[in-house]
């Protein structure tokens, strides 16, 4: 069973998590981003159910094509460059889901925008903290 | 159709700059990125870096970090990659490619007949 | 970075032969969301810029004769020429387009045998 330190600390790195991925959809969400528009033309798969830690597989599978979309608007919209970022989130991510169990993610048919993905993805951690809290 | 054609060779002598200039055709430079990549004689394929003329924004290969300035006219849909501190080793054909969609690294459809940049004392 | 790694390093067919090379990647190219091999294979003849002939490991690209096939996922891949003609004499060389930098193999010379 999960002891409160546990708890705790998964707490944290979801908040963390979650700060990450917001801060991103923040900066491409900047009403000064002229890359938007090319940006949401990219398509990025989203996982059929995310309910579970271990359903952040689904998030690490897409991190890669997340950073060089990414990259096309790194210096005006992000503090950090996007492969630092990226390998922030992969750390925690990692972390988080933990490597016992080999998980085959399953995503769903349609496809989304980077700003669909990361709102997903922002949800997610939203309700998982709100279940530990 | 998509052209891009590139300036003539160089002869550079070690420790100075060239400037290679890559005029894009048959479409609008500012819809997708423009790629560098560079052969030395006999050699493989080696990636430098792209810029999105759109808006200068740029992307280099680690390697070339700090020696290689890529910019971008739009007004002349010219494109341009400088590298200097230049030293034998960097004696190649550098090419400017053009990737087949938008996706940042998508593969290079479009390619210049490439300039031959040789560095000798 | 990705190291892509080819063989052989060159290869000597006799005309109306397949040819077949191999390129291994140091990470998988599959993007399990769309399932796609994100791999492509260039030609390249003396004096020439590259051309590419395949992407997404076996998508041929626009105008490229269909005796070019590319196959693989993961980490493994080849590309077959499957009756050599004399103007397929060339360099050939695989490239990862899933991450930067976008890394290519060293080449593998195909001749006439």
């Known amino acids: 069973a999960p002891t409160s330190s546990s708890t705790k600390k998964t707490q944290l790195q979801l908040e963390h998590l979650l700060l990450d991925l917001q801060m991103i959809l923040n900066g491409i969400n900047n009403y000064k981003n002229p890359k938007l528009t090319r940006m949401l033309t990219f398509k990025f798969y989203m996982p059929k159910k995310a309910t579970e830690l271990k359903h952040l597989q689904c998030l690490e599978e897409e991190l890669k094509p997340l950073e060089e979309v990414l990259n096309l608007a790194q210096s005006k919209n992000f503090h950090l460059r996007p492969r630092d970022l990226i390998s922030n989130i992969n750390v925690i991510v990692l972390e988080l889901k933990g490597s016992e169990t080999t998980f085959m993610c399953e995503y769903a048919d349609e496809t989304a925008t980077i700003v669909e993905f990361l709102n997903r993805w922002i949800t997610f951690c939203q309700s998982i903290i709100s279940t530990l809290t | 159709q998509v052209q891009l054609v590139q300036s003539g060779a160089e002869v550079k002598k070690p420790g100075s700059s060239v400037k290679v200039s890559c005029k894009a055709s048959g479409y609008s430079i500012t819809d997708s990125l423009i790629h560098w990549v560079r052969q030395a004689p006999g050699q493989g394929l080696e990636w430098m870096g792209w810029i999105d003329p759109e808006d200068g924004e740029i992307n280099y290969a680690q390697k070339f970090q700090g020696r290689v300035t890529l910019t971008a006219d739009t007004s002349t849909s010219t494109a341009y990659m400088e590298l200097s501190s230049l030293r034998s080793e960097d004696t190649a054909v550098y090419y400017c490619?053009?990737?087949?969609?938008?996706?940042?690294?998508?593969?290079?459809?479009?390619w210049g007949q490439g300039t031959l940049v040789t560095v000798s004392s | 970075d990705i190291v892509m790694t080819q063989s052989p390093d060159s290869l000597a067919v006799s005309l109306g032969e397949r040819a077949t090379i191999n390129c291994k990647s140091s990470q998988s190219l599959l993007r399990n969301g769309n399932q796609q091999n994100y791999l492509a294979w260039y030609q390249q003849k003396p004096g020439q810029p590259p051309k590419l002939l395949i992407y997404?490991?076996?998508t041929g690209q626009s105008g490229v004769p269909d005796r070019f096939s590319g196959s693989g996922s993961g980490t493994d891949f080849t590309l077959t020429i499957s009756s050599l003609q004399a103007e397929d004499v060339a360099v050939y060389y695989c490239?990862?387009?899933?991450?930067?930098?976008?890394?290519f193999g060293a080449g593998t010379k195909v001749e006439i045998k």
């Open positions: 490619a053009r990737s087949l969609d938008s996706y940042p690294i998508d593969p290079f459809a479009y």
């Open positions: 997404y490991a076996s």
């Open positions: 490239q990862q387009h899933y991450v930067t930098p976008p890394t």
